[in-house]
């Protein structure tokens, strides 16, 4: 049975040209995290695997940095980076947990951080 919950940074906004940290945290489960995949819509951004370390997908290498922790740092943001991001936790024995983050990249300096929220 899947008992865990994923807490994410929720709905966030950032300035064009700036950087942002995408964070997810899996709690309330003793399941072993095998791998965390970060995806934007259907595109793979990065992988963090317990045995093999970090991998940043080639098309994002210049603007994505691993960490902190299992999180992901997006740099040199553009308006095109606006959209949904998913952290997909592959765990044993529970299975797959998915967290969603919505990022809005703003032209002006009015970027504010949204509230944190949980996805069961």
């Amino acid at each position: 049975m899947m008992t865990g919950t994923i807490e994410t940074t929720g709905n966030i906004s950032a300035e064009k040209g700036g950087s942002i940290i995408l964070q997810c945290h899996l709690s309330s489960t003793t399941a072993q995290v095998t791998q965390v995949n970060w995806e934007q819509q259907d595109q793979l951004l990065a992988i963090c695997n317990a045995d093999l370390g970090w991998h940043i997908s080639p098309s994002f290498k210049d603007r994505v940095a691993p960490g902190p922790g299992l999180g992901l740092t997006l740099q040199s943001l553009t308006v095109n980076d606006t959209g949904e991001y998913f952290c997909i936790y592959h765990t044993y024995p529970d299975g797959t947990y998915t967290g969603r983050i919505f990022l809005e990249v703003l032209e002006s300096s009015v970027a504010e951080h949204g509230a944190r929220f949980q996805i069961p």
């Epitope: 995949n37 093999l52 370390g53 991998h55 044993y92």
Partner: antibody
Framework: EVQLLESGGGLVQPGGSLRLSCAAS????????MSWVRQAPGKGLEWVSL????????YYADSVKGRFTISRDNSKNTLYLQMNSLRAEDTAVYYC?????????????WGQGTTVTVSS | QSVLTQPLSASGTPGQRVTISCSGV????????VSWYQQLPGTAPKLLIY???QRPSGVPDRFSGSKSGTSASLAISGLQSEDEADYYC???????????FGGGTKLTVL
């Protein structure tokens, strides 16, 4: 179409060397962990070696450790296996295989194999 | 000697259900995922089951995988003559840090 094509097999004397290549096509090679698996005549499958996305993490079966080296060139979409100090027991069909995006899940794409014969 | 243990052979008649077992230890099957492969004579292996119980697209639902403790099994229902092949289980071993295979099971359709 997702494809793996091995080459470089042949007849070699004991103590000799051989370099196998595996050309990948139809997928983003950089995003996948790769392995070499071999099969001696009339025998079962034996895993040989594994390499992560950018080649900074490699693993080997005890039977080939110190003699074989796995590597990859992502710019050429090619996987390699450098085999040194070859022995008669290395005679086998060598397959390159792609791991599932979560590498521990399984090997989802296999090449057709290349035959290595070690004999005097 | 393979790290994972499979029966050397199995057999069944067309339409029957056949199960092939795969036995491991606490550092592989018990805490990791199992995958199963079918190898027809003279061909490369083909993935049948990944993540212990999931089927890749194109694999008939006659094939199913399950796992309990340090053992896993592959079940083939509605056996067909074209299922005659060698079947292999495999898992990542956390202690050895290696990909381990079973010795293979030769399935004969009588």
């Amino acid at each position: 179409e997702v494809q793996l094509l091995e080459s470089g097999g042949g007849l070699v004397q004991p103590g000799g060397s051989l370099r196998l290549s595996c050309a990948a096509s139809g997928f983003t090679f950089d995003d996948y962990v790769m392995s070499w698996v071999r099969q001696a005549p009339g025998k079962g499958l034996e895993w040989v070696s594994l390499i992560n996305w950018n080649g900074d993490k490699t693993y080997y079966a005890d039977s080939v450790k110190g003699r074989f080296t796995i590597s990859r060139d992502n710019s050429k979409n090619t996987l390699y296996l450098q085999m040194n100090s070859l022995r008669a027991e290395d005679t086998a069909v060598y397959y390159c295989a792609r791991h599932w995006i979560v590498f521990q899940y399984g090997l989802d794409v296999w090449g057709q194999g290349t035959t290595v014969t070690v004999s005097s | 000697q393979s790290v994972l243990t499979q029966p050397l052979s199995a057999s069944g008649t067309p339409g029957q259900r056949v199960t092939i077992s795969c036995s491991g230890v606490s550092s592989n099957i018990e805490i990791k995922y199992v995958s199963w492969y079918q190898q027809l004579p003279g061909t490369a292996p083909k993935l049948l089951i990944y993540n212990s119980h999931q089927r890749p697209s194109g694999v008939p639902d006659r094939f199913s995988g399950s796992k309990s403790g340090t053992s896993a099994s592959l079940a083939i229902s509605g056996l067909q003559s074209e299922d005659e092949a060698d079947y292999y289980c495999t898992s990542w071993d956390d202690r050895l840090k290696s990909w381990v295979f079973g010795g293979g099971t030769k399935l004969t359709v009588l």
